[in-house]
Interface confidence: low
């Protein structure tokens, strides 16, 4: 796989340097470097340096450039899905159905069957089928964290809609955690966003799998469309292949 | 700038097709196509098709692949900053400092001076210097919307820290709105995240520019580091150049 | 990844990011950029062999797709993958300006 | 952007995304991929002229950087910019599998 052309590295560097000359001027829309005749003597003003430093420094919460794709991401991912534990399961008895929240629990043995090792998981999405929604609703997703505490994960502003629509939340990190832990059933909570001074905190959005008084003949369709985790993972045998090939370079 | 080599499009297509043959097999880690001897007759099982469709369909809230950089983003952005109106301004009198919120107002005439046209703005960040923080704090950012209402913008989970740290919130859309409107003073509210069943909704985080009883000789440094908007925008003259060149292609 | 961590510490002959520091004064003869004095621009270089034909369907070649032709191009090419912006300070007349130039620093390369 | 909207409706000679539909059965002779039957793979093609030398410092050339050499490469190359994944269904023995292959569909190209 070698190439027979010898590369003149110095020539390439010179061409790159000259290209950068053009690139910078081009990005600034300058035909030539600006005149320096009027530039005041002395150091740069403090305010300008402060501004330059603000721009240069990456700060908390600012999104970095997208990371280069890790080697493992090149390979295909097997896709599986794990349905939410049905709502008649005893796990739900512990959590009183409130007006502001619904609870979704998952069987981690099913998750482990789909993804035997946490490191194999490349993406996990929680998918919910939201039914009609009359008013805009701001919802929040929480992860069951310890005995009686919940950890905030993300939020979504749901626009009113006349038709059902799938919602997707990226829960890769959470599912990876679950795969590392010994718990049997792990869960999420979807809640109305409650601001510190708001009055009405009712969860208006209707998520398929939780509505009551459903006609018997619709039960199966309804059950199939209940919340699920969509998992994308490297199959175990491919991962082993990948690990052994990683030592070559 | 033309090239004199004529390209054999059919040859390129054939090479691409053959490369895809290798790519697919390589991504699946297969040395050759899998045997079809055991494949059951008839159509694919419903569950498999449902899974395939879940994977294929993009759903609400799922992040798409990063968009290609628009032409305008290629060019350099001028960076400016607008400091928050000082807290002794009368605008703050209306908003009682509560335990769960702090308020930040900005002079839109200063914003317009920096960015004469909303379309020129490519990024606006609200930057806050958070001082030491003893406990983890979940905060939310709101935009002043109408007389007494606030619109939720985003949230952040702040980790405990012994040293001051800059926080950044992307508020491009909001600032673009402000530039299009006639208001003189516009504002943000930073609040503690209040979950529907939480007890303590106190904003624990200390933001530079709001602490009281400060020594006089520190006031200037303190004032310089008060919340500000960092703006990145295409300078007006470059934008005009850009518009005229847009018609060429 | 063909990034600075890997490429700067190896003698990789194939596609990799290569070190290149640009000193505005020395390399470009420019005094008009006041900050920074220069930057690590880097560049991508090295072959991305075309590694598929009907008579080469075997595992050894397939395993090399990842590095040499992940995009299954008809003519794979060594190009930047992760890029970072560069803020600069310069004067227009008497007025100092801070501007951010996008995609100026090459952090990693890929065959594409 | 050098995307399908622009390139498929123009006669652009320089770097652009070109149409290419792969029919698994016809083009690759494969019957083992059950879904989809084929996909719009597309590809990037066209020159990215190197457009800078010390004697060409004028606006017309500078304006072309954006298209022809935005990354200021020493040898700019026409490569994919936006890519999309492809899910497929195939069997391993009696077991159907759904797998997602990353970066399979070229939506736009760039000189890099």
């Amino acid at each position: 796989l070698s190439t027979c052309k010898t590369i003149d590295m110095e020539l390439v560097k010179r061409k790159r340097i000259e290209a950068i000359r053009g690139q910078i001027l081009s990005k600034l829309r300058l035909a030539s470097p600006p005149s320096q005749g009027e530039v005041p003597p002395g150091p740069l003003p403090e305010a300008v340096l402060a501004l330059y430093n603000s721009t240069r420094d990456r700060v908390a919460g600012e999104s970095a450039e997208p990371e280069p794709e890790p080697e493992a991401d090149y390979y295909a991912k097997e896709v599986t899905r794990v349905l939410m534990v049905e709502t008649h399961n005893e796990i739900y008895d512990k959590f009183k159905q409130s007006t502001h929240s619904i609870y979704m629990f998952f069987n981690t043995s099913e998750l482990r069957e789909a993804v035997p090792e946490p490191v194999l998981l490349s993406r996990a999405e929680l998918r919910l089928l939201r039914l009609k929604l009359k008013v805009e609703q701001h919802v929040e997703l929480y992860q069951k964290y310890s005995n009686n505490s919940w950890r905030y994960l993300s939020n979504r502003l749901l626009a009113p809609s006349d038709s059902p629509e799938w919602l997707s939340f990226d829960v890769t990190g959470v599912v990876r955690q679950w795969l590392s832990r010994g718990g049997e059933i792990e869960g999420f909570r979807l809640s109305a966003h409650c601001s510190c001074d708001s009055r009405d905190n009712t969860l208006q959005v209707d998520i398929n799998g939780f509505t009551t008084g459903r006609r018997g003949d619709l039960a199966t369709i309804h059950g199939m469309n209940r919340p699920f985790l969509l998992l994308m993972a490297t199959p175990l045998e491919r991962a082993q292949h990948l690990q052994s090939s990683r030592h070559r370079r | 700038l033309s090239t004199c080599k004529t390209i054999d499009m059919e040859l390129v297509k054939r090479k691409r097709i053959e490369a895809i043959r290798g790519q697919i097999l390589s991504k699946l880690r297969l040395a050759s196509p899998p045997s079809q001897g055991e494949v059951p007759p008839g159509p694919l099982p419903e569950a498999v098709l449902a899974l395939y469709n879940s994977t294929r369909d993009r759903v609400a809230g799922e992040s798409a692949e990063p968009e290609p950089e628009p032409e305008a983003d290629y060019y350099a952005k001028e960076v400016t900053r607008v400091l928050m109106v000082e807290t002794h301004n009368e605008i703050y009198d209306k908003f009682k400092q509560s335990t769960h919120s702090i308020y930040m107002f900005f002079n839109t005439s200063e914003l317009r001076e920096a960015v004469p046209e909303p379309v020129l703005l490519s990024r606006a960040e609200l930057r806050l210097l958070r001082l030491k923080l003893k406990v983890e704090q979940h905060v939310e950012l709101y935009q002043k919307y109408s007389n007494n209402s606030w619109r939720y913008l985003s949230n952040r989970l702040l980790a405990p820290s012994d040293s001051p740290e800059w926080l950044s919130f992307d508020v491009t859309g909001v600032v673009r709105q402000w530039l299009s409107r006639g208001g003189e003073i516009e504002g943000f509210r930073l609040s503690a995240h209040c979950s529907c069943d939480s007890r303590d909704n106190t904003l624990q985080v200390d933001i530079n520019g709001f602490t009281t009883g400060r020594r006089g000789d520190l006031a200037t440094i303190h004032g310089m580091n008060r919340p500000f908007l960092l703006l990145m925008a295409t300078p007006l003259e470059r934008a005009q150049h850009l518009q005229s060149s847009r018609h060429r292609r | 990844a063909l990034d600075t961590n890997y490429c700067f510490s190896s003698t990789e002959k194939n596609c990799c990011v290569r070190q290149l520091y640009i000193d505005f004064r020395k390399d470009l003869g420019w005094k008009w950029i006041h900050e920074p004095k220069g930057y690590h621009a880097n560049f991508c270089l090295g072959p991305c062999p075309y590694i598929w034909s009907l008579d080469t369907q075997y595992s050894k070649v397939l395993a090399l797709y990842n590095q040499h032709n992940p995009g299954a191009s008809a003519a794979p090419c060594c190009v930047p993958q992760a890029l970072e912006p560069l803020p600069i300070v310069y004067y227009v007349g008497r007025k100092p300006k801070v501007e951010q130039l996008s995609n100026m620093i090459v952090r990693s390369c890929k065959c594409s | 952007a050098l995307d399908t909207n622009y390139c498929f409706s123009s006669t652009e000679k320089n770097c652009c995304v070109r149409q290419l539909y792969i029919d698994f059965r016809k083009d690759l002779g494969w019957k083992w991929i059950h879904e989809p039957k084929g996909y719009h793979a597309n590809f990037c093609l066209g020159p990215c002229p190197y457009i800078w030398s010390l004697d060409t410092q004028y606006s017309k050339v500078l304006a072309l950087y954006n298209q022809h050499n935005p990354g200021a490469s020493a040898a700019p190359c026409c490569v994919p910019q936006a890519l999309e994944p492809l899910p497929i269904v195939y069997y391993v023995g009696r077991k159907p599998k759904v797998e997602q292959l990353s970066n399979m569909i070229v939506r736009s190209c760039k000189c890099s």
């Epitope: 534990v85 399961n89 005893e90 069987n107 043995s109 099913e110 482990r112 035997p116 955690q177 590392s180 832990r181 010994g182 718990g183 049997e184 059933i185 | - | - | -």
Partner: antibody, heavy 122, light 112 residues
Framework: EVQLVESGGDLVQPGGSLRLSCAAS????????MDWVRQAPGKGLEWVSR????????FYTDSVEGRFTISRDNAKNTLYLQMNSLKSEDTAVYYC???????????????WGQGTQVTVSS | ATMLTQSPGSLSVVPGESASISCKAS???????????LSWLLQKPGQRPQLLIY???NRASGVPDRFTGSGSGTDFTLKISGVKAEDAGVYYC?????????FGSGTRLEIR
């Protein structure tokens, strides 16, 4: 042969701290989840804490949550239990255990250490 | 928490006879994977506990076949046939179906 040897038990005053160690040998330590179980004088067994093989996740019984911290050093094949704000009811023999997960087809503790005595008294 | 109630609290057996210990759970110990994670342990006088039975009826390695576990749901039994002097000690049932994990109160077996 699998061996688990606890150490660090002592007499300590209420409110004090203690760090127990468990040296493991005879198996690939980093592949197994590990637990601590205690036995108060003349009483039965009480599960206290668990840690995953990587050390990434820890579990505690309610009565010790926030006071005890389980950790491990896979390079040293050692399991730890840092016990702070000790109370008289924490007096017990503390055992270190190897847990075989359900994924490993058991879901039970297969090996126990000999135990180390912790006495909390003024 | 899941309560495990053992009975009897103690029993005295002549060598060669059989002994039976009961363990009742406050809820079914059948896990959602269909398995029941109930185990039996023996703590001989002055010694550490040792595993006898896991998943209701599986003997741990090195455990003699005179120890037999049975039961399902909430009711479980450990039977020792042909008791030997070395079987003396406290027997505990333990569940690892639900978190937090629980042990029974123990049954003391005395050899007369």
């Amino acid at each position: 042969e699998v061996q688990l040897v606890e150490s660090g038990g002592d007499l300590v005053q209420p409110g004090g701290s203690l760090r127990l160690s468990c040296a493991a040998s005879g198996f690939t330590f980093s592949s197994y989840w590990m637990d601590w179980v205690r036995q108060a004088p003349g009483k039965g067994l009480e599960w206290v804490s668990r840690i995953t093989n990587s050390g990434g996740t820890a579990f505690y019984t309610d009565s010790v949550e926030g006071r005890f911290t389980i950790s491990r050093d896979n390079a040293k094949n050692t399991l730890y239990l840092q016990m702070n704000s000790l109370k008289s009811e924490d007096t017990a023999v503390y055992y270190c255990l190897r847990y075989i997960t359900r994924a490993q087809l058991m879901g039970a503790w297969d090996y126990w250490g000999q135990g180390t005595q912790v006495t909390v008294s003024s | 928490a899941t309560m495990l109630t053992q009975s009897p609290g103690s029993l005295s057996v002549v060598p060669g006879e059989s002994a039976s210990i009961s363990c009742k759970a406050s809820q079914s110990l059948v896990h959602t994977d269909g398995k029941t994670y109930l185990s039996w342990l023996l703590q001989k006088p002055g010694q550490r506990p040792q595993l006898l039975i896991y998943q209701v009826s599986n003997r741990a390695s090195g455990v003699p076949d005179r120890f037999t576990g049975s039961g399902s749901g909430t009711d479980f039994t450990l039977k020792i046939s042909g008791v030997k002097a070395e079987d003396a000690g406290v027997y505990y049932c333990a569940q690892s179906t639900y978190y937090p994990y629980d042990f029974g109160s123990g049954t003391r077996l005395e050899i007369r």
